[in-house]
Amino acid sequence: FNMDTRKPRVIPGSRTAFFGYTVQQHDISGNKWLVVGAPLETNGYQKTGDVYKCPVIHGNCTKLNLGRVTLSNVSERKDNMRLGLSLATNPKDNSFLACSPLWSHECGSSYYTTGMCSRVNSNFRFSKTVAPALQRCQTYMDIVIVLDGSNSIYPWVEVQHFLINILKKFYIGPGQIQVGVVQYGEDVVHEFHLNDYRSVKDVVEAASHIEQRGGTETRTAFGIEFARSEAFQKGGRKGAKKVMIVITDGESHDSPDLEKVIQQSERDNVTRYAVAVLGYYNRRGINPETFLNEIKYIASDPDDKHFFNVTDEAALKDIVDALGDRIFSLEGTNKNETSFGLEMSQTGFSSHVVEDGVLLGAVGAYDWNGAVLKETSAGKVIPLRESYLKEFPEELKNHGAYLGYTVTSVVSSRQGRVYVAGAPRFNHTGKVILFTMHNNRSLTIHQAMRGQQIGSYFGSEITSVDIDGDGVTDVLLVGAPMYFNEGRERGKVYVYELRQNLFVYNGTLKDSHSYQNARFGSSIASVRDLNQDSYNDVVVGAPLEDNHAGAIYIFHGFRGSILKTPKQRITASELATGLQYFGCSIHGQLDLNEDGLIDLAVGALGNAVILWSRPVVQINASLHFEPS
């Protein structure tokens, strides 16, 4: 109707990076920018994705290099993390959130795709990492190996081989395992501290240079106490599981101290594995019963999990696998191993800023049934799996509903702010829920809408619209972009109007009657008043229209509702040649060229497009007859 299609600003970017997948208008002290997501952007050797800031009038885009942001204390994998897949602007302070839902980190032998987001302040500086689903690895362990190096240990090389082989089984790295080694006889020494080495390679190299220190006495209690009171302190990490491995070949010369030493280890929650090497006893034909009892006393209960004995030093190699497996069986404690909580949650697949924080869709949470998490300045709220059961019953738990594919919120005069999330795969037809979140990790689900057609992806896009700008939501629009009709993937946008406390279905928006795939409703944007009639408007994207060139539809708001026939359809082909997937993202909240009119930003494959609004001239005709 009044969007200019003759002089758009087409901002080019990388097609392979999918520059344009997301777009947001941005204002810094009166300077206007587009923030553009490129989720397949490369940083060095990794396809991390990234975000660009693009000047509105002229000039080139600048990469923000958010793909280089690293989280300390985790072994992260940023390749294919899809940074920029979702963007959310906070209009209060003009900061924004850029999410990497496929960001993952190494935990033992697994990679957990928890997702993470970067908060960027109004002047495009990274300020904070938001990763509410990130949990400590079960391999977040500080392991101290307490080695008997007294004279009776022979040959030392076998002890060294054992040490190297067990170290090779450990997942050493940030956020995972740290290893320290102490050697004792009459005295105790640090061979290396917990935080001296950060990789298996470095630890193994250090271990290969440990020499036997000797000693006529075996002060095992002192060695254990030294490990507890010193080795776990020097480089030890708060919250890390403390594991001690004691390897000795004889009764201790300070066994009367063991009771107190073990009590203190218990108090410090140190899990103790103890290995009795019987070489000295077997070589001399001595009964090892007293020795074995002592080693069992040192080992944590139950003995069958924590105590080992080997016939001699050479046999140490035979327990490497068993010891490693027992240590890592700590990983799965009290866990149903076939089930995922937040480990694969893909948090940040969608994002939405609310007054007290940000909502993040986590489609992979709870075995891909999905969830919505909330991060606030006061902490995070992660609803329990059970809190969704009312609308996502147990019998459908293996269907992968993908709740959190999109998130938004509505405001009703009675209930205040209510959150909205889409689950486009729920029972194959899709579902949208409206809910409030509580600090005790429960939800109250107020309403649910269900899709009609299998595979339509109902709920993959949701937008709330305050038509008259009174602060209360008037309309909720739900996209089902894969809705199949007349032999094609046409797409559909459902209209729900707020009546008292409930949203009531009120038809669908009309698209064009072309006979190709369109995916109408892939993106739906609530935009500020485009046609200067004081009602806010809606723009819907159909990125597959015109043979994947794409198109957008502009619908005008009117008296608390929305007019279901588009006032303007803009196709990619009328703007520039070569545009593809035009309409995959839309944002329209700012006047970008200072003419007093709201302008549109539209994403395409490898491009961001700015469409300028033109003024609307209201002509009021009045007839005067003279003489009357």
Epitope: F222, D254, E259, I262
Partner: antibody, heavy 120, light 109 residues
Framework: EVQLVESGGGLVQPGGSLRLSCAAS????????IHWVRQAPGKGLEWVAS????????YYADSVKGRFTISADTSKNTAYLQMNSLRAEDTAVYYC?????????????WGQGTLVTVSS | DIQMTQSPSSLSASVGDRVTITCRAS??????VAWYQQKPGKAPKLLIY???SLYSGVPSRFSGSRSGTDFTLTISSLQPEDFATYYC???????????FGQGTKVEIK
């Protein structure tokens, strides 16, 4: 030759204090444990306290807990028993003895004993 | 705490007699049980350690044995210098808490 010599005994009034010493020779105190054992006139042996000079861990009999303190000075190769709030029933001959790995945790060497009399 | 109950509290025997003294532990204990001999006005002397091992310099007529929670000191042929009081002592495992029996006085018949 291994030797333990106690000193510091004597007459003390109830509520008073006394410090007993046990000087060791012929071995290092920090490779063993020292125990104090007492014997009241005409009675049997009663264990009082022990210390590991190396780790400084201590143990006490319930009858003396909170009143007696065992300590050791490895540089002087001497153990001590500080006795406070003494009572008539603490009257006894006090022996120190060595306890270590090589005697399979038995008291293999004893001092000659020192008499402590608590009386008003 | 473990109690050591020693019996008998006294016995009369003649030179050449076989003498047996028993200590019963109130609960299952390790073999860290020792036996001492004490003569009037003297410090105790170690005879047996680890329930059955003879301490160096101690005559072989002294022996120790264990059966469950019962520990026995045997003097195979009593000699005049053996008239004394005998004590058993138990070491609590992995601590230096020790307990003595009440003692057995061996007198000349």
């Amino acid at each position: 030759e291994v030797q333990l010599v106690e000193s510091g005994g004597g007459l003390v009034q109830p509520g008073g204090s006394l410090r007993l010493s046990c000087a060791a020779s012929g071995f290092n105190l920090d490779s063993s444990y020292i125990h104090w054992v007492r014997q009241a006139p005409g009675k049997g042996l009663e264990w009082v306290a022990s210390i590991s000079s190396y780790s400084s861990y201590t143990y006490y009999a319930d009858s003396v807990k909170g009143r007696f303190t065992i300590s050791a000075d490895t540089s002087k190769n001497t153990a001590y028993l500080q006795m406070n709030s003494l009572r008539a029933e603490d009257t006894a001959v006090y022996y120190c003895a060595r306890y270590w790995y090589y005697s399979a945790w038995a008291l293999d060497y004893w001092g000659q004993g020192t008499l402590v009399t608590v009386s008003s | 705490d473990i109690q050591m109950t020693q019996s008998p509290s006294s016995l009369s025997a003649s030179v050449g007699d076989r003498v047996t003294i028993t200590c019963r532990a109130s609960q299952s204990v390790s073999s860290a049980v020792a036996w001492y001999q004490q003569k009037p006005g003297k410090a105790p002397k170690l005879l047996i350690y680890s329930a059955s091992s003879l301490y160096s310099g101690v005559p072989s007529r002294f022996s120790g044995s264990r059966s469950g929670t019962d520990f026995t000191l045997t003097i195979s042929s009593l000699q005049p210098e053996d008239f004394a009081t005998y004590y058993c002592q138990q070491s609590a495992p992995y601590s230096s808490l020790i307990t003595f029996g009440q003692g057995t006085k061996v007198e000349i018949k």
